[in-house]
């Protein structure tokens, strides 16, 4: 029959070549001379000429060693024709199967594999997977079947079998307890991959297992006792740096310290922060300490980590004795800002108030006083008693120095410490109004027509405060009432001046007396320009000239 069973050819054949494989034979050769040929990849198409057939004999030849890893199977067609070129058979499929030889060693996909596992994990925990490939066949033979093993472990602490590798998957797992990063931070495993399922060629690689840190070490104070000296009143002052040691991985949450003041800070005077690099606890004052109130504080500070402990660990506590140092403190005016009501215009030498300071220090220090700022120069201060007296006229209406009835003075107290210290106080004198200003009309110059004159409305102002102001009263004096009338409006804050008799064009003085609600009288002369005109005028018209 015109059939050929699949032909198996081992790869890497040593020849000699050409090498006979099989003979193509058609039973039609009894009747006629048959010529044989082959087609297909490996014969007449790339890779050309690997196989050939002797035309007359039908012998199929192999011309070179085969490589299964390059081409594992060739599919050719055999042809049989008679002398005249006519096909005597249908094309026949010729399958040439290249059988595997163990001509490749396993190859790890990396020279060095890296994995990690948390310290203290239980046996059976998976660490990493390594992979080796083998180009040889692993389906029909064991040539490409890789078995993994661990050849060596460095270091061999706590013993030499800390890990195991699954022979077929390459998964490395922990096999023993006792992984302790603080003792062995990294293991180097020499791993092997052996083909023939462990009985063939071997290759090696390295698996580096990093032991990851767990928070299994508590931070410990070193030392545990501290003494510090802090000047009183200092805020944000560094009191002490507390040092801890932690065997866990530096700069990790398992190493970074968290400090807590557990006791001794009843007044909430202290705060503690962690230095980001050194991991020290920096104890500082949150508020000023008072030597006179308490000259020593004993603090208890506990340290933990940012990360929780993975097992129950005793916490470390430090004791800090803080000695408060006495400082010569400045005298403090009581109150710091003193409001005193005083009548304006009091006589010179009249006492205004006593304004004194207290010294926080316990020694009986002498305090002396002086005025630091007195813009108008109205006051004096006794250096010993703190008595403030008037040396000038206090004028509530002085707009340069008085704002909203208040005259502000700054005083200074100085102790006799070494060096001396000073404190300041603010004396706010609220000046009580006195009716020391009469009403004044505005404007004080008017222009008016002598025919059908318009009434002149003048505003009345008084620098004093109510009740020393409106309602005002008006009165014309010195015969001004012959030609003029003056009437205060209903509100009592304006005066209406009217011309009641004809006056020739000229300038006249109108004597107007205004008095306030406290009967404080003020005489004002109004300059009235009378013009020859009718009704309203602002300036007198010039003389009319005829033509």
């Amino acid at each position: 029959d015109w059939v050929v069973a699949p032909i198996s050819v081992p790869e890497n054949g040593k020849g000699p070549f050409p090498q006979r494989l099989n003979q193509l034979k058609s039973n039609k050769d009894r009747d006629t001379k048959i010529f044989y040929s082959i087609t297909g990849p490996g014969a007449d198409s790339p890779p050309e000429g690997v196989f050939a057939v002797e035309k007359e004999t039908g012998w199929l030849l192999l011309n070179k060693p085969l490589d299964r890893e390059e081409i594992a199977k060739y599919e050719l067609f055999g042809h049989a024709v008679s002398e005249n070129g006519a096909s005597v058979e249908d094309p026949m499929n010729i399958s040439i199967i290249v059988t595997d030889q163990n001509d490749h060693k396993p190859k790890f996909t990396q020279d060095t594999f890296r994995g990690s596992v948390l310290e203290g994990v239980l046996p059976g925990t998976s660490v990493m997977q390594v992979t080796a490939t083998d180009e040889d066949d692993a389906i029909y033979t064991y040539n490409g079947v890789v078995a993994y093993s661990i050849h060596s472990q460095e270091p061999k602490d706590p013993h030499d079998l800390m890990f195991t590798i699954h022979r077929s998957t390459g998964t490395i797992s922990v096999i023993s307890s006792g992984l302790d990063r603080e003792k062995v931070p990294e293991y180097t495993l020499t791993i092997q991959a052996t083909d023939m399922d462990g009985d063939g060629s071997t290759t090696t690689a390295v698996a580096v297992v990093e032991i990851l840190d767990a928070n299994d070490n508590a931070p410990m104070f070193d030392p545990q006792k501290y003494e510090a000296h802090v000047p009183e009143n200092a805020v944000g002052h560094e009191v002490q740096r507390l040092t801890v040691t932690d065997l866990d991985a530096p700069n990790s949450p398992a190493w970074r310290a968290t400090y807590l003041i557990m006791g001794g800070d009843d007044g909430d005077h202290f705060t503690i922060t962690t230095h980001p690099e050194s991991n020290q606890g920096i104890l500082t004052t949150r508020k000023g300490l008072d030597f006179e109130a308490k000259n020593q504080h004993t603090l208890y500070v506990e340290v933990t980590n940012e990360a929780p402990f993975v097992l129950k660990l005793p916490t470390s506590t430090a004791t800090i004795v803080v000695h408060v140092e006495d400082v010569n403190e400045a005298p403090v005016f009581v109150p710091p800002s003193k409001v005193v009501e005083v009548q304006e215009g009091i006589p010179t030498g009249e006492p205004v108030c006593v304004y004194t300071a207290e010294d926080p220090d316990k020694e009986n220090q002498k305090i002396s006083y002086r005025i630091l700022r007195d813009p108008a120069g109205w006051l004096a201060m006794d250096p010993d008693s703190g008595q403030v007296t008037a040396v000038g006229t206090l004028d509530r209406e002085d707009e340069q120095f008085v704002r909203n009835n208040i005259y502000e003075v700054m005083v200074l107290a100085m102790d006799n410490g070494s060096p001396p210290t000073t404190g300041t106080g603010t004396l706010l004198l609220t000046l009580i109004d006195v009716n020391d200003h009469g009403p004044v009309p505005e404007p004080r110059q008017i222009t008016i027509c002598n025919q059908s004159p318009v009434r002149q409305v003048l505003n009345i102002t008084d620098k004093d405060l109510s009740p020393h102001t409106s309602p005002f009263q008006a009165q014309l004096t010195d015969d001004s009432d012959i030609y003029w009338t003056a009437e205060v409006n209903e509100e009592g804050d304006t005066v209406v001046l009217s011309l009641k008799k004809f006056l020739k064009q000229d300038t006249y003085d109108v004597h107007l007396s205004l008095s306030d609600h406290g009967n404080k009288e003020q005489l004002t002369v109004i300059r009235a320009t009378v013009c020859d005109c009718h009704g309203h005028v602002e300036t007198c018209p010039g003389p009319w000239k005829g033509g």
Partner: antibody, heavy 118, light 107 residues
Framework: EVQLLESGGGLVQPGGSLRLSCAAS????????MSWVRQAPGKGLEWVST????????YYPDSVKGRFTISRDNAKNTLYLQMNSLRAEDTAVYYC???????????WGQGTLVTVSS | DIQMTQSPSTLSASLGDRVTITCRAS??????LIWLQQKPGKAPKRLIY???SLDSGVPSRFSGSGSGTEFTLTISSLQPDDFATYYC?????????FGGGTKVEIK
């Protein structure tokens, strides 16, 4: 009838070159592997080279590798042997021979004498 | 390389004699062996291939046998045309190697 006819032999000085030819007829030359075999005067036979039917692959023993090159022109039904760096020990009758039934050496030519001498 | 040792190197025989020539391979070559006949001044001629298969046109008095490393060529009844030198060639391993030859002459 299968016929193989060698030519190109002759006298050549050591270090010289020579090209032998083998003209084939009476069979489908292009479908048979071909070889060269030599026989030193009064000595036995020695295989020199083989080439696959399509000319894609060539084979040599160590004694001639790098010096001799076998080739073929299937269109001309001719086999060649280019011999370079000739030595006195290359003196021999050179035969071309065909594979037949997939094995050596089914048919032989009459041979051509190559003499390497100064 | 595989060495092929032929014996004897010379053999004197008479017409009609049964003649046996031996070829020994230094390594196993299976049945990959041919026998060649060469007459003086002539090209060799293949007689037997695959240890025991006769080429077409070869008289049946020639036969071959053996496998592995020991091979024999037998001429059952020596004829005048059989006086020649006989060579074995192994093609089981590269390079192809010949035996040293056995000269069969008239006694």
């Amino acid at each position: 009838e299968v016929q193989l006819l060698e030519s190109g032999g002759g006298l050549v000085q050591p270090g010289g070159s020579l090209r032998l030819s083998c003209a084939a007829s009476g069979f489908t030359f292009s479908s048979y592997a071909m070889s060269w075999v030599r026989q030193a005067p009064g000595k036995g036979l020695e295989w020199v080279s083989t080439i696959s039917s399509g000319g894609h692959y060539t084979y040599y023993p160590d004694s001639v590798k790098g010096r001799f090159t076998i080739s073929r022109d299937n269109a001309k039904n001719t086999l060649y042997l280019q011999m370079n760096s000739l030595r006195a020990e290359d003196t021999a009758v050179y035969y071309c021979a065909s594979y037949y039934y997939g094995i050596p050496f089914g048919y032989w030519g009459q041979g051509t004498l190559v003499t390497v001498s100064s | 390389d595989i060495q092929m040792t032929q014996s004897p190197s010379t053999l004197s025989a008479s017409l009609g004699d049964r003649v046996t020539i031996t070829c020994r391979a230094s390594q196993d070559i299976g049945i990959n062996l041919i026998w060649l006949q060469q007459k003086p001044g002539k090209a060799p001629k293949r007689l037997i291939y695959d240890t025991s298969s006769l080429d077409s046109g070869v008289p049946s008095r020639f036969s071959g046998s053996g496998s592995g490393t020991e091979f024999t060529l037998t001429i059952s009844s020596l004829q005048p045309d059989d006086f020649a030198t006989y060579y074995c060639l192994q093609y089981g391993s590269s390079p192809l190697t010949f035996g040293g030859g056995t000269k069969v002459e008239i006694k």
